[in-house]
């Protein structure tokens, strides 16, 4: 048993038929010695009396909020949560496996630049009795500080018959140098509590591997005289690391017809302009990627040809 | 990245072209190592990230763009002193820091070159003949070092008498290639920045 936060405890249980469970001793936080009784939130009966209560925690019926009382007055609470381990594997019932980039990916993270700021998100189909808390550090043996905000519900989607909820959190490395070469990964730890079930999820990454620039901005077309060609120009996104001559981007320019079946013309360039042929009803899209370290491409920025 | 990209102008800062070739070569070599050594821990997640230049050179600090010198977190250890007279330097414009930066890059290349050559010698003794270092990568390191053209004591190539542990050598190769790729990215960024200045 270990303390998750004040008055909230996690009991780690090996989950198999007729498992013996874990013996837990609860102590009432009071100077009182006599006349103390104990109750469990989901049952109205008195479980025991005295300053301590010994319980055998085997299943979810044994978890919950234990309260000690004296003469109708509440003295203190202890909330017991269960963390299930089956066949040596901790349960992952709360979050959805996003399966990208690989199976058992519950947390996904992205950074718009090298400032040490990143966002992580996760998915669940649960909407009630659910809480998250997030911690992060650089490295694990001698951790350096990363500060994370509160996890918030960032999107709700209908997937087939089901609602899916996306939660996200923003974190910032306390002392990040954008030019630094990372040798220790960022560790992100999410504590998830659904009802009386505790689970934890972790992700480990280098900022350089989760970079995804914002799309290029100010995408403009300038027709060239007596020609079907146009000059496309754009700018680095505002959120990208500076100076741009050090943190350089490379770009992909695509001309796409109205129909998805039409052949796409693509040009790659390190410049912030390109000359392309603009077909009728086509659109021109540009996306960006770190020039020297091939992490993710940005989303497309698009303008119609007409 | 196997994509059509325009070639650099000949009037560019001479080392930029070499540093781009270096990054391409080390990235290709790393990809080849990952594929060939697929049953070895050779991915970024699996290996220990070691920097053989740690405490010996300080390329990141010495080559920090001016704009980042205001960032406290970037100014951990800026005390470095290296001999200067590189041909990449457009002499009048060169600041003392730029000279330190380029000589630090040169020292990095020299250290990696020695490590890679030592490692290659061991890999050539492997009866499995599973993987060798790409001669192109070694040549590109050499070309960039020549372009930097610094005077520096030659580091003797390490030779070991004991029988090499080929498993360990291959793991070490992966560690070395990952670290060198990261350093090659920094070198490319620096050359791009200096070129723009």
């Amino acid at each position: 048993i270990w303390e998750l936060k004040k008055d909230v405890y996690v009991v780690e249980l090996d989950w198999y038929p007729d498992a013996p469970g874990e013996m837990v001793v609860l102590t009432c936080d009071t100077p009182e010695e006599d006349g103390i009784t104990w109750t469990l939130d989901q049952s109205s009966e008195v479980l025991g009396s005295g300053k301590t209560l010994t319980i055998q925690v085997k299943e979810f019926g044994d978890a919950g909020q234990y309260t000690c009382h004296k003469g109708g007055e509440v003295l203190s609470h202890s909330l017991l949560l269960l963390h299930k381990k089956e066949d040596g594997i901790w349960s992952t019932d709360i979050l959805k496996d996003q399966k990208e980039p690989k199976n058992k990916t519950f947390l996904r993270c992205e950074a718009k630049n090298y400032s040490g700021r990143f966002t992580c998100w996760w998915l669940t189909t649960i909407s009630t009795d659910l809480t998250f808390s997030v911690k992060s550090s650089r490295g694990s043996s001698d951790p350096q500080g990363v500060t994370c905000g509160a996890a918030t519900l960032s999107a709700e989607r209908v997937r087939g018959d089901n609602k899916e909820y996306e939660y996200s959190v923003e974190c910032q490395e306390d002392s990040a140098c954008p030019a630094a070469e990372e040798s220790l990964p960022i560790e992100v730890m999410v504590d998830a509590v659904h009802k009386l079930k505790y689970e934890n999820y972790t992700s480990s990454f280098f900022i350089r591997d989760i970079i995804k620039p914002d799309p290029p901005k100010n995408l403009q077309l300038k027709p060239l005289k007596n020609s079907r060609q146009v000059e496309v120009s754009w700018e680095y996104p505002d959120t990208w690391s500076t100076p741009h001559s050090y943190f350089s981007l490379t770009f992909c320019v695509q001309v796409q017809g109205k129909s998805k079946r039409e052949k796409k013309d693509r040009v790659f360039t390190d410049k912030t302009s390109a000359t392309v042929i603009c077909r009728k009803n086509a659109s021109i899209s540009v996306r960006a990627q770190d020039r020297y370290y091939s992490s993710s491409w940005s989303e497309w920025a698009s303008v119609p040809c007409s | 990245r196997n994509l059509p990209v325009a070639t650099p102008d000949p009037g560019m800062f001479p080392c930029l072209h070499h540093s781009q070739n270096l990054l391409r070569a080390v990235s290709n070599m790393l990809q080849k190592a990952r594929q060939t050594l697929e049953f070895y821990p050779c991915t970024s997640e699996e290996i220990d990230h070691e920097d053989i230049t740690k405490d010996k050179t300080s390329t990141v600090e010495a080559c920090l763009p001016l704009e980042l010198t205001k960032n406290e977190s970037c100014l951990n250890s800026r005390e470095t002193s290296f001999i200067t007279n590189g041909s990449c330097l457009a002499s009048r414009k060169t600041s003392f820091m730029m000279a330190l930066c380029l000589s630090s890059i040169y020292e990095d290349l020299k250290m990696y070159q020695v490590e890679f050559k030592t490692m290659n010698a061991k890999l050539l003794m492997d009866p499995k003949r599973q993987i060798f270092l790409d001669q192109n990568m070694l040549a590109v390191i050499d070309e960039l070092m020549q372009a930097l053209n610094f005077n520096s004591e030659t580091v003797p190539q390490k030779s070991s008498l004991e029988e090499p542990d080929f498993y360990k050598t291959k793991i070490k190769l992966c560690i070395l290639l990952h670290a060198f790729r990261i350093r090659a990215v920094t070198i490319d960024r620096v050359m791009s920045y200096l070129n723009a200045s």
Epitope: D41, Q42, E59, F60, G61, G64, Q65, L79, S91, D93, T125, I126, S127, T128, D129, N162, K163, K195, L196, K197 | -
Partner: antibody
Framework: QIQLVQSGPELKKPGETVKISCKAS????????MNWVKQAPGKGLKWMGW????????TYADDFKGRFAFSLETSASTAYLQINNFKNEDTATYFC??????????????WGQGTLVTVSS | SIVMTQTPKFLLVSAGDRVTITCKAS??????VAWYQQKPGQSPKLLIY???NRYTGVPDRFTGSGYGTDFTFTISTVQAEDLAVYFC?????????FGGGTKLEIK
């Protein structure tokens, strides 16, 4: 002991509004969520949604968004269900049901006796 | 929404029999399943929560088991007062859905 007592049966014309009350006693009202469940004659149970008795925030199941409203009178430990623009298909027994615990909102440990609301044509 | 398919719809048994009702969820609901008993003209009563935990005061002849998508409710020795409709309910994901019910009749 813990009790949920609901208001009596109602006979409503289509288009009218009905408001059902559910008075709780025997526990701290604001510690436990209050759910509403519909049971059409001879049919199964359908969860309508719940109201957080501490914050007053209601949550509705998709089928009960729009014409249905949950509310509270905390000082009287009472929860309400209001149905606007009553329709034929709203004829049913409506139950209020208290959550099992502070941590388990949508398992129903205590139920009101039910309020039958019938449409009169 | 998650569909809870409860079988059988009807059960005609004699006192002393063992009865098993099953509930199949259309997707995994972990162990977030409850079982209720509704006697004629009454409101439902909670018997089992978290798939296998008996609620306070519920006789131990009532048991529940299961995880993921398949759940079972058992009355080890049926008694005359067990005449009722039994419902399963998933309380994993909103909307919290009930099975169609199993009507238990005593011969």
């Amino acid at each position: 002991q813990i009790q949920l007592v609901q208001s009596g049966p109602e006979l409503k014309k289509p288009g009218e509004t009905v408001k059902i009350s559910c008075k709780a006693s025997g526990y701290t009202f604001t510690n436990y969520g209050m759910n509403w469940v519909k049971q059409a004659p001879g049919k199964g149970l359908k969860w309508m949604g719940w109201i957080n008795t501490y914050t007053g925030e209601p949550t509705y199941a998709d089928d009960f968004k729009g014409r249905f409203a949950f509310s509270l009178e905390t000082s009287a430990s009472t929860a309400y269900l209001q149905i606007n623009n009553f329709k034929n298909e709203d004829t049913a027994t409506y139950f209020c049901a208290r959550s099992l615990s502070t941590m388990i909102t949508t398992t129903f440990a205590y139920w009101g006796q039910g309020t039958l609301v019938t449409v009169s044509s | 929404s998650i569909v809870m398919t409860q079988t059988p719809k009807f059960l005609l048994v004699s006192a002393g029999d063992r009865v098993t009702i099953t509930c199949k969820a259309s997707q995994s609901v972990s162990n977030d399943v409850a079982w209720y008993q509704q006697k004629p003209g009454q409101s439902p009563k909670l018997l089992i929560y978290y798939a296998s935990n008996r609620y306070t005061g519920v006789p131990d002849r009532f048991t529940g088991s299961g995880y993921g998508t398949d759940f079972t409710f058992t009355i080890s020795t049926v008694q005359a007062e067990d005449l009722a409709v039994y419902f399963c309910q998933q309380d994993y994901s909103s909307p919290y859905t009930f099975g169609g019910g199993t009507k238990l009749e005593i011969k």
